[in-house]
């Protein structure tokens, strides 16, 4: 999937965690098919 950023964001961010995607893990691998 693709995400485009660089437009105004209306998502609220926690002040304690970065809103960037966490490091990839194999648990996030998409199912084949």
């Amino acid at each position: 999937s693709e995400t485009t950023t660089g437009t105004s964001s209306n998502s609220s961010q926690s002040t304690s965690n970065s809103g960037l995607a966490p490091n990839p893990t194999n648990a996030t691998t998409k199912a084949a098919g």
Partner: antibody
Framework: QVQLVQSGAEVKKPGASVKVSCKAS????????MNWVRQAPGQGLEWMGE????????TFNQKFKSRVTMTRDTSISTAYMELSRLRSDDTAVYYC???????????WGQGTTVTVSS | DIQLTQSPSFLSASVGDRVTITCRAS??????LAWYQQKPGKAPKLLIY???TLHSGIPSRFRGSGSGTEFTLTISSLQPEDFATYYC?????????FGQGTKLEIK
Amino acid sequence: QVQLVQSGAEVKKPGASVKVSCKASGYDFTGYHMNWVRQAPGQGLEWMGEINPITSDKTFNQKFKSRVTMTRDTSISTAYMELSRLRSDDTAVYYCARRDYGTSLDYWGQGTTVTVSS
Amino acid sequence: DIQLTQSPSFLSASVGDRVTITCRASKSISKYLAWYQQKPGKAPKLLIYAGSTLHSGIPSRFRGSGSGTEFTLTISSLQPEDFATYYCQQHNEYPITFGQGTKLEIK
């Protein structure tokens, strides 16, 4: 040790495309997002986007969305960035950089100079 | 997008001086600010992340502080190898953005 080694300098005509490679070594390539950042001559740093090496999910800067293609080949631990419909103002050094969630862009490639000239 | 404004843009100093560079964000980025050093013809090098954490191998004369919208990078005693351009970068949200840079020159 972590190393990111990029492909060599390119000279392109306006309207053409360029594809830059970034070969990673010294760490698990699939464990970190690969980012692309460019720097025009005498200018600052501009983030283009990133790719998740496992899922191939991408996040782009809106400015580049319509012209940039990011891919990867996990079998050879290499990421690619292709920029199409080149213009003279795309003349820049293009960097790949590993992004760690905690530390941000912690390791960078040496840069690839792309010159767009007729 | 979050705008980052660095000040000053240019800074002249001497070896042994203490210098401070400021980075202001257009909205709160919590602690998620990184600092990079770049020398001519070279890639940027990470110095500090999460506002104040020194990256591995970076000398302790580099110190980052701040949170929210105002951050500072302090070099306690300038060494000859410290003359370079410094960039701040927020890693709180997409799109990742950088400050315009501060060029540190020898006086």
